[in-house]
C-alpha cells in the first residue's frame, strides 16, 4: 500500500507512517515503527500536558510565588496546569496571573462601582450630583447626600462630590 500523506485525528505522520499521539497527561518516549506502537509515559509529579501530543517533555506546573502575592486557586494535575490567584486585597496584573498588585482605592469624589476580585482591579466611578465620597477606599460606594427635608432641617451648606450637605435648623422667623 502507498504510504499515507495525512493521518486520522489523534495521529501524526512520521517516517511515512501514521503514529498515535500520546494522550493528555503523557509524553512521547518513542515514535511508532513497523514493529511497535507509539510509546508514551505519564508526566511526573508537578508536570502536565493538556493536549494529545508528541512532546518528549512535560511542562512544569506553574509556581504560585507567595513573594509575588500569589496563592494556589486550583492544584494542577497531569493534564492541567496549576491556576494561581492573588491573596486577599490583591489582584492579578495579567490574564496569566504571574504577579499581583494591591487593589486600587477610589479617591474622595469617587466611589466603588465594582469591588476588585483576585483577577480584576477595583472599578471606580465619579460620584454623580446628589452623591459623595469623602474617603479613599477600595470598598465604599458613593453615598447619597443627607436629605435635610426628611429631618425637618434645611441645607445650610451645599454638598459636593466629596462632602455631604450640612443641615441646620429652619429659620424660625420665616413664615
Amino acid at each position: 500500500p502507498e504510504p499515507p500523506t495525512a493521518c486520522r485525528e489523534k495521529q501524526y505522520l512520521i517516517n511515512s507512517q501514521c503514529c498515535s499521539l500520546c494522550q493528555p497527561g503523557q509524553k512521547l518516549v518513542s515514535d511508532c515503527t513497523e514493529f511497535t506502537e507509539t510509546e508514551c509515559l505519564p508526566c511526573g509529579e508537578s508536570e502536565f500536558l493538556d493536549t494529545w501530543n508528541r512532546e518528549t517533555h512535560c511542562h512544569q506546573h506553574k509556581y504560585c510565588d507567595p513573594n509575588l502575592g500569589l496563592r494556589v486557586q486550583q492544584k494542577g494535575t497531569s493534564e492541567t496546569d496549576t491556576i494561581c490567584t492573588c491573596e486577599e486585597g490583591w489582584h492579578c496584573t495579567s490574564e496569566a496571573c504571574e504577579s499581583c498588585v494591591l487593589h486600587r482605592s477610589c479617591s474622595p469624589g469617587f466611589g466603588v462601582k465594582q469591588i476588585a476580585t483576585g483577577v480584576s482591579d477595583t472599578i471606580c466611578e465619579p460620584c454623580p450630583v446628589g452623591f459623595f465620597s469623602n474617603v479613599s477606599s477600595a470598598f465604599e460606594k458613593c453615598h447619597p447626600w443627607t436629605s435635610c427635608e426628611t429631618k425637618d432641617l434645611v441645607v445650610q451648606q451645599a454638598g459636593t462630590n466629596k462632602t455631604d450637605v450640612v443641615c441646620g435648623p429652619q429659620d424660625r422667623l420665616r413664615a
Epitope: 517516517n15 498515535s20 518513542s30 515514535d31 513497523e34 514493529f35 511497535t36 506502537e37
Partner: antibody
Framework: QVQLQQSGAELMKPGASAKLSCKAT????????IQWVKQRPGHGLEWIGE????????KYNEKFRGKATFTSDTSSNTVYMQLSSLTTEDSAIYYC???????WGQGTTLTVSS | DVVMTQTPLSLPVSLGDQASISCRSS???????????LHWYLQKPGQSPKLLIY???NRYSGVPDRFSGSGSGTDFTLKISRVEAEDLGVYFC?????????FGGGTKLEIK
C-alpha cells in the same frame, strides 16, 4: 546510511562476564529502540530485550533478566549488552537490531568454554 | 509467552514453484489499536535476518512482489509465487504484539 557495527567474536570462560557492543551510525541514535536477539543452532531466534538509548528505558524478556543488562553511551552512539555468570548455554550468535526499518548488526559470536 | 508455531519445518521446492509457509500463534496478535504485529524474515547462511513482510501483509522496501503475506488473529501465511534461487534459506515469523517478542522455529526452503 543506517549501520550497526558489532564487536568481534569472544571466547570466554564459564562464570565470567562478557560485554558486547553495537555502534549505531546514520540516524538519530536516541530516536529508536535497539533490540538484542540470540541465535543458537537448534534453538532458533530468541528475543532478549531492547533499550532506548539516552533515557535508558529498557524492556527485558524475563528469561534473560539477571543474565543480560543493557546500557547505552550517547557520546559514542553505542549500545552495550553485558552477559553475566556465563555458561555453555550462553554460547551463541548475538545480534543487535534497530526497531524501525530493517537494520541489523553482523552478529557477535560468543563461545563459552573451559 | 506467545508461542509461534511454523509449518512445515522443511519445504523442498523446484525453482519457479509456489511456496507457502504457515505460522500460528498461541494467542491473538491483534492489539488494542487493532494493529497486528506479525512479520516475516528470511535468513541466509552466515547472514543476519532480512525483513520481508511487516504487519501481516506489508512488503518491506525493496522486497520483490512475489512475496506476499496474509492472515489475521492467530493464523498467518507467507506465499512466494515463483521461487527463485536467491529465495532459499530459513524463513521466520516474528510477533511484536506481546512482550516478550517471539520468533517461530523457522522453515527451511530448499531445492527439491
Amino acid at each position: 546510511q543506517v549501520q550497526l557495527q558489532q564487536s568481534g567474536a569472544e571466547l570466554m570462560k564459564p562464570g565470567a562476564s562478557a560485554k558486547l557492543s553495537c555502534k549505531a551510525t546514520g540516524y538519530t541514535f536516541t530516536g529508536y529502540w535497539i533490540q538484542w536477539v540470540k541465535q543458537r543452532p537448534g534453538h532458533g531466534l530468541e528475543w532478549i530485550g531492547e533499550i532506548l538509548p539516552g533515557g535508558d528505558h529498557t524492556k527485558y524478556n524475563e528469561k534473560f533478566r539477571g543474565k543480560a543488562t543493557f546500557t547505552s553511551d550517547t557520546s559514542s552512539n553505542t549500545v552495550y549488552m553485558q552477559l553475566s555468570s556465563l555458561t555453555t548455554e550462553d554460547s551463541a550468535i548475538y545480534y543487535c537490531a534497530r526497531v524501525g526499518g530493517d537494520y541489523w548488526g553482523q552478529g557477535t559470536t560468543l563461545t563459552v568454554s573451559s | 509467552d506467545v508461542v509461534m508455531t511454523q509449518t512445515p519445518l522443511s519445504l523442498p521446492v523446484s525453482l519457479g514453484d509456489q511456496a507457502s509457509i504457515s505460522c500460528r500463534s498461541s494467542q491473538s496478535l491483534v492489539n488494542s489499536n487493532e494493529n497486528t504485529y506479525l512479520h516475516w524474515y528470511l535468513q541466509k547462511p552466515g547472514q543476519s535476518p532480512k525483513l520481508l513482510i511487516y504487519k501481516v501483509f506489508n512488503r518491506y522496501s525493496g522486497v520483490p512482489d512475489r512475496f506476499s503475506g496474509s492472515g489475521s488473529g492467530t493464523d498467518f501465511t507467507l506465499k512466494i509465487s515463483r521461487v527463485e534461487a536467491e529465495d532459499l534459506g530459513v524463513y521466520f515469523c516474528f510477533q511484536s504484539t506481546h512482550v516478550p517478542w517471539t520468533f517461530g522455529g523457522g522453515t527451511k526452503l530448499e531445492i527439491k
